[in-house]
């Protein structure tokens, strides 16, 4: 019986675990891993905590090991080219003899500290209309942005700042499936910069 595709998220340069979750390791004969090509074979080892891995593709040499008793597969020192579909064909002693588990590996960078850029739109009667833009250093996939304390989503925030709001701090949190990071700017700093005639501000 073939399974659904299980999404696995990994961090560039770090390790990821494919959850095979074998419940009866005594019945496993061999597990064949394939991606774009054959990746590895995993067979029972005399140490029940460490099945034996035979890597079949040079791109994975010295980067793969398996964990007992569940046969979970670990790829370390992740590269962007490791991303894609993986298949584990599990051959057992018992009917149905072969079952297949499928995975999709997504790889992301661990996010660095985002930068907040401000642009003055207008300043009237002690109220400043400011646009804050939050961005991470490299253009990344699947990055979402959130602003507190307003709860706004998206990387752009428009603010109508009054003197009474001076104590507020605006925090942008950038997040992807594997990490998050934040930066803040104070309202006092925003309007002070405007009063001094600055048009933009970079934090950090």
């Amino acid at each position: 019986k073939d399974s659904e595709i299980f999404t696995v998220n990994g961090i560039l340069g770090e390790s990821v675990t494919f959850p095979v979750n074998i419940q009866e390791p005594r019945q496993v004969k061999i597990i064949a891993w394939t991606s774009k090509t054959s990746v590895a074979y995993v067979t029972p080892g005399d140490s029940e905590t460490a099945p034996v891995v035979t890597v079949t593709h040079r791109n994975y040499y010295e980067r793969i090991h398996a964990l007992g008793p569940n046969y979970n597969l670990v790829i370390s020192d992740l590269r962007m080219e490791d991303a894609g579909d993986y298949k584990a064909d599990i051959n057992t002693q018992a009917d149905p003899y072969t079952t297949t588990k499928r995975y999709n590996l997504q790889i992301y960078r661990r996010l660095g500290k985002p930068k907040i850029t401000q642009s003055l739109m207008a300043s009237v009667n002690s109220t400043c209309n400011v646009t804050l833009t939050c961005s991470v250093e490299k253009e990344e996939k699947n990055v979402t942005y959130n602003w507190s304390p307003l709860g706004e989503e998206g990387n752009v925030l428009q603010i109508f700042q009054t003197p009474e709001d001076q104590e507020l701090t605006y925090t942008c949190t950038a997040q992807n499936p594997v990490s998050n990071n934040s930066d803040s700017i104070s309202a006092r700093q925003l309007c002070a910069d405007i009063a001094m005639g600055f048009r933009t501000h970079h934090t950090g």
Epitope: T43, P44, G45, T99
Partner: antibody
Framework: EIQLVESGGGLVKPGGSLRLSCAAS????????MHWVRQAPGKGLEWMGW????????TLADDFKGRFTFSLDTSKNTAYLQMNSLKIEDTAVYFC??????????WGKGTTVTVSS | EVVMTQSPGTLSLSPGERATLSCRSS???????????LEWYQQKPGQAPRLLIY???NRFSGIPDRFSGSGSGTDFTLTISRLEPEDFAVYYC?????????FGPGTKVDIK
Amino acid sequence: EIQLVESGGGLVKPGGSLRLSCAASGYTFTTYSMHWVRQAPGKGLEWMGWIDTATGEPTLADDFKGRFTFSLDTSKNTAYLQMNSLKIEDTAVYFCVKSAYWYFDVWGKGTTVTVSS
Amino acid sequence: EVVMTQSPGTLSLSPGERATLSCRSSQSIVHINGNTYLEWYQQKPGQAPRLLIYKVSNRFSGIPDRFSGSGSGTDFTLTISRLEPEDFAVYYCFQGSHVPWTFGPGTKVDIK
């Protein structure tokens, strides 16, 4: 404390059906496989097979394929043994047994099935 | 299928005596990973079996050290060094190396 409690046994006529339940508590149900073992009156133990509690994939010993099926309700932490076309020789105590990868560590007390006309 | 045989069928002994129970498999039960998954279970009347020994010689948690297991390949032994009153029961060996997994017919240890 880990516990397995079987229920659903009773008297049934040949050709009839019965569904046995095994309610598990005290551990994460979907981490370990659940096995079924039966014991005819005055006889030894017979391994029937097991079910993967994470995927629902059953493995039955050849002698039990066809008339017997394993299933789960993970929301109730319960495993089931469905027995159809029962024969007099299916009369036995039926045990559910938790595996701990390399051995059976917890057994239920068993439920008695009597097939008689 | 691996057939497990046990001898003797019944062993009549007194408390304090040594019990030696034998189990033999019809073929080697060394698993492909090199381990031997031979277990011993104890069953008292009206109760479920309980695990005593796994992987030939490893005592399960809470099992007294008067119980010991030994053997290799196809011949295995359970030894109870000094029988206590609570040890009188039926003992089953079991192999979990080759599917279908199989139990022996049991050895009954009763009071002489």
